[in-house]
């Protein structure tokens, strides 16, 4: 029962996490204009992995896609790749884990096969979560670097009283969504891996052997109990699991033609 609960919970947590990774990847608010130096701006800029947007006080939002591949920074491309890898792995993991769920009967699938699939999906979720966390963290690091660089040359005076304030960007909502989603996917994956251990069928063999000593009518049944731990030599209906996973991350962004100010 506990195994089923752990597996089910792991699946749900991973599902929420992957939905979050997809949402973060699609969001436009990966970086948002820092309003510290101009809190009364009538024009607000924000950027995603796929496009940049400008929201005016009028209520109109204009978004422009990055219609170039070669002209984009390598780091942005890397983040995109990480997020996409995370989504793909997560999606495959979800598909695999659906069939692995103990509460779902598919033909005459053995518990060992379900355990296998649970572990596979768990590893995929872990890698997916790590991808998302890595991607978001790379982007955040890029923002921090650019923020301090732009702060260094914030005022590029054009002589006299004219002031040109350089637009600085800070963390957007998508980064926090991505971090949380990546963490949830990771946790879900760990839970699936834990559930997999409990799913592996425990084999109990009772072998009664009678030894008839001459002149005695005593039957000996020596230590015929063998509890299968997965580390012994009894391999019937048994599999020894071990696995590790690493992951990275990537991103995308959605449209919002009429965002509101």
């Amino acid at each position: 029962m506990a195994v089923t609960a752990c597996q089910g919970l792991g699946f749900v947590v991973s599902l929420i996490g992957i939905a979050g990774i997809i949402a973060a990847t699609c969001m436009d608010q990966w970086s948002t204009q820092d309003l510290y130096n101009n809190p009364v701006t009538a024009v607000f800029n924000y950027q995603g992995l796929w496009r940049s947007c400008v929201r005016e006080s009028s209520g109109f939002t204009e978004c422009r896609g990055y219609f170039t591949l070669l002209g984009l920074p390598a780091m942005l491309q890397a983040v995109r790749a990480l997020m996409i890898v995370g989504i793909v792995l997560g999606a495959i993991g979800l598909l695999v884990s659906i069939f692995a769920l103990k509460c779902i009967r598919i033909g005459s699938m053995e518990d060992s096969a379900k355990a296998n699939m649970t572990l596979t999906s768990g590893i995929m979720f872990i890698v997916s979560g790590l991808c998302a966390i890595a991607g978001v963290s790379v982007f955040a690091n890029m923002l921090v670097t650019n923020f301090w660089m732009s702060t260094a040359n914030m005022y590029t005076g054009m002589g006299g009283m004219v002031q040109t304030v350089q637009t600085r960007y800070t963390f957007g909502a998508a980064l926090f969504v991505g971090w949380v989603a990546g963490g949830l996917t990771l946790i879900g994956g760990v839970m699936m891996c834990i559930a997999c251990r409990g799913l592996a069928p425990e084999e109990t063999n009772y072998k009664a052997v009678s030894y008839h000593a001459s002149g005695h009518s005593v039957a000996y049944k020596p230590g015929g109990f063998k509890a299968s731990t997965g580390f012994g030599s009894n391999t019937k209906n048994k599999k020894i699991y071990d696995g590790g996973a690493r992951t990275e991350d990537e991103v995308q962004s959605y449209p919002s033609k009429h965002d509101y100010v």
């Epitope: 204009q33 101009n38 009364v40 701006t41 009538a42 024009v43 800029n45 940049s52 947007c53 400008v54 005016e56 006080s57 009028s58 209520g59 109109f60 204009e62 422009r64 054009m158 004219v162 002031q163 040109t164 304030v165 350089q166 637009t167 009429h258 509101y260 100010v261």
Partner: antibody
Framework: EVKLVESGGGLVKPGGSLKLSCAAS????????MAWVRQAPGKGPEWVAF????????HYVDTVTGRFTISRENAKNTLYLEMRSLRSEDTAMYYC???????????WGQGTSVTVSS | DIVMTQSPSSLTVTTGEKVTMSCKSS????????????LTWYQQKPGQPPKLLIY???TRESGVPDRFTGSGSGTDFTLTISSVQAEDLAVYYC?????????FGAGTKLELK
């Protein structure tokens, strides 16, 4: 057809209060940023107050901050400007206007006159 | 606050003449996010509210004759009327639409010679 009609202006003593209304038709005010602009006799226009389409961003010119309150009633499609502690320098024609692309004011009402005098 | 300075304060012209008026801003009105200048031009005739002519410094509002042209970027902007008509006699105002308060210039009055 987009139309803005202001009302509520009049003669008021210094320190008095007035509430201006701007009835909009032909569009939904909750889709646009809205502004009040005033123009003193013989002077240029002066932007007074702004309210964003979802009403979470409100700005005032420094000279009216704390005295004027901009608000909107979406159900009535009406914009308001509540003016308290009026001064003689608040005497002007008050226009309500709709914000458009580039934060430009594309539609203006015909204005309502406010005179602050003892 | 952003200060908008218009020059000249008045212009005396004859119909058919080309007219240029200037507007200077104390701060940059170019938004890096979309590379647009948040400057608007209005025309106001006596007894009427201002009428929108040009937004984003150079985008003509629909219905505005193409003899009106806005140009400039950053802090220096210009409104040009290629061939002044009698109905163009009015006061022209520029406005900062980049930062609150959305300040107006003092205006340029176009008068007939």
């Amino acid at each position: 057809e987009v139309k803005l009609v202001e009302s509520g202006g009049g003669l008021v003593k210094p320190g008095g209060s007035l509430k201006l209304s701007c009835a909009a038709s032909g569009f939904t005010i909750s889709d646009y940023g809205m502004a009040w602009v005033r123009q003193a006799p013989g002077k240029g226009p002066e932007w007074v107050a702004f309210i964003s389409n979802l009403a979470y961003s409100i700005h005032y010119v420094d000279t009216v901050t704390g005295r004027f309150t901009i608000s909107r009633e979406n159900a009535k499609n009406t914009l308001y400007l509540e003016m308290r502690s009026l001064r003689s320098e608040d005497t002007a024609m008050y226009y309500c206007a709709r914000m458009y692309y580039g934060n430009a004011l594309d539609y203006w009402g015909q204005g309502t006159s406010v005179t602050v005098s003892s | 606050d952003i200060v908008m300075t218009q020059s000249p304060s008045s212009l005396t012209v004859t119909t058919g003449e080309k007219v240029t008026m200037s507007c200077k801003s104390s701060q940059n009105l170019l938004n890096s996010g979309n590379q647009k200048n948040y400057l608007t031009w209005y025309q106001q005739k006596p007894g009427q509210p201002p009428k929108l002519l040009i937004y984003w410094a150079s985008t003509r509002e629909s219905g505005v004759p193409d003899r009106f042209t806005g140009s400039g970027s950053g802090t220096d902007f210009t409104l040009t009327i290629s061939s002044v008509q009698a109905e163009d006699l009015a006061v022209y105002y520029c406005q900062n639409d980049y930062s609150f308060p959305l300040t107006f210039g003092a205006g340029t009055k176009l008068e007939l010679k």
